[in-house]
């Protein structure tokens, strides 16, 4: 008789999840010499241990601590790029500007990027049918808690000038409910971080508005200033041109406003 299985509102665990995590770990540690010491089987065991046999609405940051410990990594604290609702451009940027890092350029972020996972209470099975949705089901689900944990640690590690890429095409350019707005902003350390610089990425070709004056950006400035961190903002009017100039700053197209 088939066991009754909880139906959640979100998509189930990504197919071949264990194999994907293990393969990504091996690939990452091969490419990044400073992480060669990492034992990927132990990483997978710690990852699995965070959510297997646990109720997927009752996951805590403590569940992920063994994984966090194994994935401890030092990135240059002054070369951190945060992003909100504009992941692809942020990743294209760090693929060219190799000495800057998004969370997904670290081992733990790389392992989990774009994946979904959850287990079931009291069974060792992975649930490939459905997983809890953050809004419709519960916020303390395995995926949300993972990203909250790694995002907090990433923000805590930042120093000097921290950059954040924001999507100027969204109705809320800065969204207090995003991971950036709810976790990272509040975990920047004022004794280490001097400035948060926002890069507002324009979508329209002929959009010459100063989106740094947007009410949500002013809200971000207020939150950051109250935390004793300077705030600055830059419009990126032409993201395609910006990437071109990152690739080659000597390019003649970089002589005009990006």
């Amino acid at each position: 008789v088939p066991r009754w299985r909880q139906q959640w509102s979100g998509p189930g665990t990504t197919k071949r999840f264990p194999e994907t995590v293990l393969a990504r770990c091996v690939k990452y540690t091969e490419i990044h010499p400073e992480m060669r010491h990492v034992d990927c089987q132990s990483v997978w065991d710690a990852f699995k241990g965070a959510f297997i046999s646990k109720h997927p609405c009752n996951i805590t940051e403590e569940d992920y601590q063994p994984l966090m410990k194994l994935g401890t990594q030092t990135v240059p604290c002054n070369k951190i790029l945060l992003w909100s609702r504009i992941k692809d451009l942020a990743h294209q940027f760090t693929q060219v500007q190799r000495d800057m890092f998004t969370l997904e350029d670290t081992l733990l972020g790389y392992l989990a990027d774009d994946l979904t996972w959850c287990g079931e209470f009291n069974t060792s099975k992975i649930n490939y049918q459905s997983c809890p949705d953050w809004r419709k089901d519960c916020s303390n689900n395995p995926v949300s808690v993972f990203w909250k944990t790694v995002s907090r640690r990433f923000a805590e590690a930042a120093c000097d000038v921290v950059h954040v890429m924001l999507n100027g095409s969204r109705s809320k350019i800065f969204d207090k409910n995003s991971t950036f707005g709810s976790v990272e902003v509040h975990n920047l350390q004022p004794e280490k971080v001097q400035t948060l610089e926002a890069w507002v990425i324009h979508g329209g070709r002929e959009d010459s508005r100063d989106l740094c004056q947007d009410p949500t950006i002013k809200e971000l400035e207020s939150i950051i200033s109250k935390r004793n961190i300077q705030f600055s903002c830059k419009n990126i009017y032409r993201p395609d041109k910006f990437l071109q100039c990152v690739k080659n700053p000597e390019d003649s197209s970089c002589t005009s406003e990006i």
């Epitope: 500007q97 000097d160 000038v161 950059h163 610089e197 300077q230 700053p249 970089c254 002589t255 990006i258």
Partner: nanobody, 125 residues
Framework: EVQLVESGGGLVQAGESLRLSCAAS????????MGWFRQAPGKEREFVAA????????WYGDSVKGRFTISRDNAKNTVYLQMNNLKPEDTAVYYC??????????????????WGQGTQVTVAS
């Protein structure tokens, strides 16, 4: 190619003020990150101040914090260094520097691409 021309150096008494200017040409100024460094005889080049790419945020070397202010006028393609309450130990050649990669804010001289010829600041006690 970016050209940087500093001006405003000179001889002053301790406690007095000076304002250095650095005029940039050859690039869109708003794409550049700007900084000031100084070098005293027999010493390494030392970070003084820099602004972020937007020009709206600034940071300083520990020895000048609270006394020096970096600012920029994008309309004039010029960056300034206002130096107050000068001390004899501020005596050095002051250099303006530009980063083509304006998006990286840094205090490392080797991450700046273009340099001015320098202007001498001498503070007498």
């Amino acid at each position: 190619e970016v050209q940087l021309v500093e001006s405003g150096g000179g001889l002053v008494q301790a406690g007095e003020s000076l304002r250095l200017s650095c005029a940039a040409s050859g690039r869109t100024f708003t794409n550049l990150g700007m900084g000031w460094f100084r070098q005293a005889p027999g010493k390494e080049r030392e970070f003084v101040a820099a602004d972020t790419w937007s020009g709206t945020s600034t940071w300083y070397g520990d020895s000048v914090k609270g006394r020096f202010t970096i600012s920029r006028d994008n309309a004039k393609n010029t960056v300034y260094l206002q130096m107050n309450n000068l001390k004899p130990e501020d005596t050095a050649v002051y250099y303006c520097a530009a980063r083509l990669r304006g998006w990286i804010t840094t205090r490392k001289p080797n991450e700046y691409d273009y340099w001015g010829q320098g202007t001498q600041v001498t503070v007498a006690s």
